[in-house]
Amino acid sequence: KSPVFGPQEVSSVEGNSVSIKCYYPPTSVNRHTRKYWCRKGASGRCITLVSSEGYVSSNYAGRANLTNFPENGTFVVNIAQLSRDDSGHYKCGLGINSRGLSFDVSLEVSQGPELPNGTEVYTVDVGRTVTIKCPFKTENAPKTKALYKKIGQTSVLVIDSRNYVNPNYKDRIRLRIPGTGQLIFTVVIDRLRLSDHGLYLCQAGDGSNRDEKNADLQVLEPEPELVYEDLRGSVTFHCALGLEVANVAKFLCRVNSRETCDVVINTLGKRDSAFEGRILLNPQDKDGSFSVVITGLRKEDEGRYLCGAHSDGQLQEGWPIQAWQLFVNEESTIPRSPTVVKGVAGGSVAVLCPYNPKESQSLKYWCLWEGAQNGRCPLLVESQGLVQEQYEGRLSLLQEPGNGTFTVILNQLTTQDAGFYWCLTNGDTRWRTTVEIKIIEGEPNLKVPGNVTAVLGETLNIPCHFPCKFSSYEKYWCKWSNTGCQTLPSQDEGPSEAFVNCDENSRLVSLTLNPVTRADEGWYWCGVKQGHFYGETAAVYVAVEEKKVAGSRYVSPAKADAAPDEKVLDSGVREIENKAIQDPRLFAEEKVVADTGDQAGGSRASVDSSSSEEQGGSSK
């Protein structure tokens, strides 16, 4: 017998979708071989309809796909917009269609149940609203209007124009009789329940002259939308529940083994601690729709998620919901990068951020996750160089090492920098990742003087001491600007007003400014790196003043206050100045650090080569 397994019989109705899961032994060969879905013809041949190599037959174009999950030993065939022509015998299999590694599947697509003539069909999701239209003749205009539900051979009164309301429909049903001349009455049922499903009968008048109209109400629990995302990546659940619940509290919950639904996040401020630092509920639009972003996906995040609306912020019967089944693919295209980066107070961290390597031109961003209420993520830095003012002189985003990774360096660390940060781009949103910065005990490895005052026209020498463990690293000094950190030329690159000389024996790298000019004022970083991978940095501020007889040696620059208006991560990312907008709600305005204009364009930079789950910054 074949080791491939799947559903032997699949039945559905026209217009529906099916998702057929086939199982195979997850050997190395099986995991990587071709997967296919084919239809058996009268001749016995099996014609491929869709395969894992990207082939889709013309009959299936735009309505079918095949997704392989090699780590689980499964693949899934999704087919939408079913018609009765899709009924037939199929095979799901591995390798070549004519070989034995396959499983027979029978698909039957029917028209749906037989209904009385002239029956109007209403198909509505649970929790939503239906309006049943009931026509009548002029002579029945003054007579009683009613809606009955057919249960077996009997009819149960649901509502009538004499103010009767069946207790099962209390507070969620109304009968509307229009003004004269309109020969139709309507019955509106809100917050539909699964139990409302069935055949209804509208009636106007009585006796042999009464008007009747059948209505078939199909209340559907929303079929979970299948969502396949990569381990370590990001998923966005877009939830549109309708205007009726625009002002009601919203939630996302996950169905547990007891078949209840645990709140993951809601607009009342509740959040599951398992999602700390990696979830945002984005503000809702006027139509009540909202989205939830989860980053740093883990295998244990798999499951069925529901979004909904209810004043309690949790699942209640008869309120609208939307459903997703999330699968997390362990054979991820998103590379491993540290989820925790450690630094010491006064020291620095260099964070590696992955992005889709096919999108090297995309704008890169780094934001600080804030957990208050629904969560938000104000942008701190972006690849175009705009930086929040309070990070002036200590934060830089570098395009290096490139090819799917950029680097963010943050120095002058304090305990307040501990927290969760998100790496993102204005491209593929699935590549959003989360990193946690932890501040640990210890001393910075690089030692520089406190802030320095230089005198115009004189020579300034700033030492940077480094320990032996960095002797094989490249050392550099650079001048920070809001567009990066411009490396200063070393002595052997020819004469320069600012040059670096290094005495390896004294484990010292010095910055010399000779002569000091007004343009030299600003932040300087001393750092170490290995190729394009950056290690620790230390920052020093150089203030420039006129020659005078007496004066203070050190100057501390005034720190800028926090920008009152700041850009905030929402469900999409856009370029500044409204170019290539994906989601116009992304940011509010932001005060940015003005570029001093004294730097050559571009920057050279890179990141720590650690590939473990924890990446160190400065350590003891």
Epitope: F5, P7, V10, N16, V18, Y23, T74, E259, T260
Partner: nanobody
């Protein structure tokens, strides 16, 4: 919690038929997957058949050993799943268990199911 109660087991001759029922109650959320497993005397519990549904789409899975002889079906209105067993063989003798879950990764794996009935004995004599 979900309660599952099996019925319909008994003693029959080889070649006869039996129909097992599994009634589900107490659900707070729609169950999408219900299955039948069996445990022959002195052996491990094994997969027999599973039915899962989503809206008006139904998926039926069968073990090779029962294909063509057993049919799984459901009655939504009664919250009941049935196993129609035809052409019974002595090797079908076992305690038959009903199982249910919201989502299962592999319908053949007993550990994927969250709820189980007490079981009903089916004995097929030759």
């Amino acid at each position: 919690q979900v309660q599952l109660v099996e019925s319909g087991g008994g003693l029959v001759q080889a070649g006869d038929s039996l129909r097992l029922s599994c009634a589900a109650s107490g659900r707070t959320f729609t169950t999408y997957v219900m299955g039948w497993f069996r445990q022959p005397p002195g052996k491990e519990r094994e997969f027999v058949a599973t039915i899962s549904w989503s809206g008006s789409t139904t998926y039926k899975y069968y073990a090779d050993s029962v294909k063509g002889r057993f049919t799984i079906s459901r009655d939504n209105a009664k919250n009941t799943v049935y196993l129609q067993m035809n052409s019974l063989k002595p090797e079908d003798t076992a305690v038959y268990y009903c199982a249910a879950s919201t989502v299962v990764a592999d319908p053949r794996a007993p550990n994927e199911y969250d709820y189980w009935g007490q079981g009903t004995q089916v004995t097929v004599s030759s």
